[in-house]
Interface confidence: low
C-alpha cells in the first residue's frame, strides 16, 4: 500500500522539515524560516508558535517541531499545550475578574492557582471538626464522640480536592 501511495502521491516522499511545494512540481522544499512540519507528506509548513509577552519559550521551534511555551514567573499554564497563562495568586486566594481575592469564610485554596473550595463538612460523615479550617487549609475531621472506642482511627483525611476548571473572562 505504501508503495502505491507514494507512486500516486509524490508528496508522501517529503520528510518532516519539508513541504510538498505544488508551485515547484511537487518537489520537497525545506520549511521556510520561522516554520515547521512535524510529519512527512505535508503540503505546508506551519508558522512557528511565538512565545511572547507572558509566555516564555520552553523549547525553541525547529524545522520539524513547533516551539513550546510555558509562563513567566507569577503565572501558570492553562489549556492544552499551555494555550493560556493565568496569573498566580497566593494560597488562600482565588483569581477573579478583578484580580486575586481572599477566599470567603468557609472556603479555602491551598494552591497558587484554581478556585476556593468549601471546607469539608465533617458532620456529613458523622465526624466532628478536629482542626478548624483557614483560607489556606481545609478543616481536619476527627472522630465523633461515638467513634472514640479502642482501635478507632482518630483522624480522617479531608476529601480530595476536585481539579478546578476556572479561568478569568
Amino acid at each position: 500500500f505504501e508503495r502505491t501511495r507514494s507512486l500516486q502521491d509524490p508528496c508522501s516522499n517529503c520528510p518532516a522539515g519539508t513541504f510538498c511545494d505544488n508551485n515547484r512540481n511537487q518537489i520537497c522544499s525545506p520549511c521556510p524560516p520561522n516554520s515547521f512540519s512535524s510529519a512527512g507528506g505535508q503540503r505546508t509548513c506551519d508558522i512557528c508558535r511565538q512565545c511572547k509577552g507572558v509566555f516564555r519559550t520552553r523549547k525553541e521551534c525547529s524545522s520539524t517541531s513547533n516551539a513550546e511555551c510555558d509562563c513567566t514567573p507569577g503565572f501558570h499554564c492553562l489549556g492544552a499545550g499551555c494555550s493560556m497563562c493565568e496569573q498566580d495568586c497566593k494560597q488562600g486566594q482565588e483569581l477573579t475578574k478583578k484580580g486575586c481575592k481572599d477566599c470567603c469564610f468557609g472556603t479555602f485554596n491551598d494552591q497558587k492557582r484554581g478556585i476556593c473550595r468549601p471546607w469539608t463538612n465533617c458532620s456529613l460523615d458523622g465526624k466532628s471538626v478536629l482542626v478548624n479550617g483557614t483560607k489556606e487549609r481545609d478543616v481536619v475531621c476527627g472522630p465523633s464522640p461515638a467513634d472514640l472506642s479502642p482501635g478507632a482511627s482518630s483522624v480522617t483525611p479531608p476529601a480530595p480536592a476536585r481539579e478546578p476548571g476556572h479561568s478569568p473572562q
Epitope: 513541504f19 521556510p32 524560516p33 520561522n34 516554520s35 505546508t44 508558522i47 511572547k52 509577552g53
Partner: antibody, heavy 116, light 107 residues
Framework: QIQLVQSGPELKKPGETVKISCKAS????????MHWVKQAPGKGLKSMGW????????TYADDFKGRFAFSLESSASTAYLQINNLKNEDTATYFC?????????WGQGTSVTVSS | DIVMTQSHKFMSTSVGDRVSITCKAS??????VAWYQQKPGQFPKLLIY???IRHTGVPDRFTGSGAGTDYTLTISSVQAEDLALYYC?????????FGGGTKLEIK
C-alpha cells in the same frame, strides 16, 4: 496598544525606487513575522511574502521575486519594503501585517503611484 | 497556489438580517482559513482565524464555520457598520492566498 504605522503616500516615475516603512509598537517586534500585502486599485489582496523579524530572512511569493526586497531595522521596530525599477503595474496600496496564525494587526497602508 | 473562490462578488442585505458569505478552496485547506473585513478607505481587519476562532474584540454576531474546501462567514444580525468587503484567506500552503472578496451592501 498594538499599532503598525506606515510611511506616507509616494508618487514615483517608472524606473525609480521606493522604500516604504512600517513601524511597530505595543509588542515585542522580533516575536512575530511581518507580512506584506499588495492591493491594486479596485482589486483584492495579494500576499507578497514575509520577513522573519528574528533573523531578518525574507520569503517572497513567486510574483514578487526580483525587484522587491524586505528588510528590517530591529532597533527601531521597523520593517521596510523596497521596490526597485518601478513599473506602472506597481501602482497600489501596500500593507504590512503582523502575523500570528493570521494577519492579526495591519498598517494603515501606503499608496504608491507610478506615473510618468 | 491554492485558489480561494468567493462566488458572490456582491451581497445585498438589510439591517437585522442574517447573511452568510462563502469561500471555496481549490483543495482541502484543513481549516487553515481566516476572514478579514475591509471598510472603504481602511486597512483590512482580522475577524476569524482557524476557520472559527474570533479575533480579540470581534463582535459575537460574526461566526466562522467550515472544513475541507468549504468555509462560511456568517453575520447573525447585520448592522449598518458591517458594510464592507470581506475576504477569506488560506494559510495551508505558502504563500497565503486571499479570495477575491465579497462586498456586503446594505439595502
Amino acid at each position: 496598544q498594538i499599532q503598525l504605522v506606515q510611511s506616507g503616500p509616494e508618487l514615483k516615475k517608472p524606473g525609480e525606487t521606493v522604500k516604504i516603512s512600517c513601524k511597530a509598537s505595543g509588542y515585542t517586534f522580533t516575536d512575530y513575522s511581518m507580512h506584506w500585502v499588495k492591493q491594486a486599485p479596485g482589486k483584492g489582496l495579494k500576499s507578497m511574502g514575509w520577513i522573519n523579524t528574528e533573523t531578518g530572512e525574507p520569503t517572497y511569493a513567486d510574483d514578487f521575486k526580483g525587484r522587491f526586497a524586505f528588510s528590517l531595522e530591529s532597533s527601531a521596530s521597523t520593517a521596510y519594503l523596497q521596490i526597485n525599477n518601478l513599473k506602472n503595474e506597481d501602482t497600489a496600496t501596500y500593507f504590512c501585517a503582523r502575523y500570528d496564525y493570521a494577519m492579526d494587526y495591519w498598517g494603515q497602508g501606503t499608496s504608491v503611484t507610478v506615473s510618468s | 497556489d491554492i485558489v480561494m473562490t468567493q462566488s458572490h462578488k456582491f451581497m445585498s442585505t438589510s439591517v437585522g438580517d442574517r447573511v452568510s458569505i462563502t469561500c471555496k478552496a481549490s483543495q482541502d485547506v484543513s481549516s487553515a482559513v481566516a476572514w478579514y473585513q475591509q471598510k472603504p478607505g481602511q486597512f483590512p481587519k482580522l475577524l476569524i482565524y482557524w476557520a472559527s476562532i474570533r479575533h480579540t474584540g470581534v463582535p459575537d454576531r460574526f461566526t466562522g464555520s467550515g472544513a475541507g474546501t468549504d468555509y462560511t462567514l456568517t453575520i447573525s444580525s447585520v448592522q449598518a457598520e458591517d458594510l464592507a468587503l470581506y475576504y477569506c484567506q488560506q494559510r495551508y500552503t505558502t504563500p497565503p492566498t486571499f479570495g477575491g472578496g465579497t462586498k456586503l451592501e446594505i439595502k
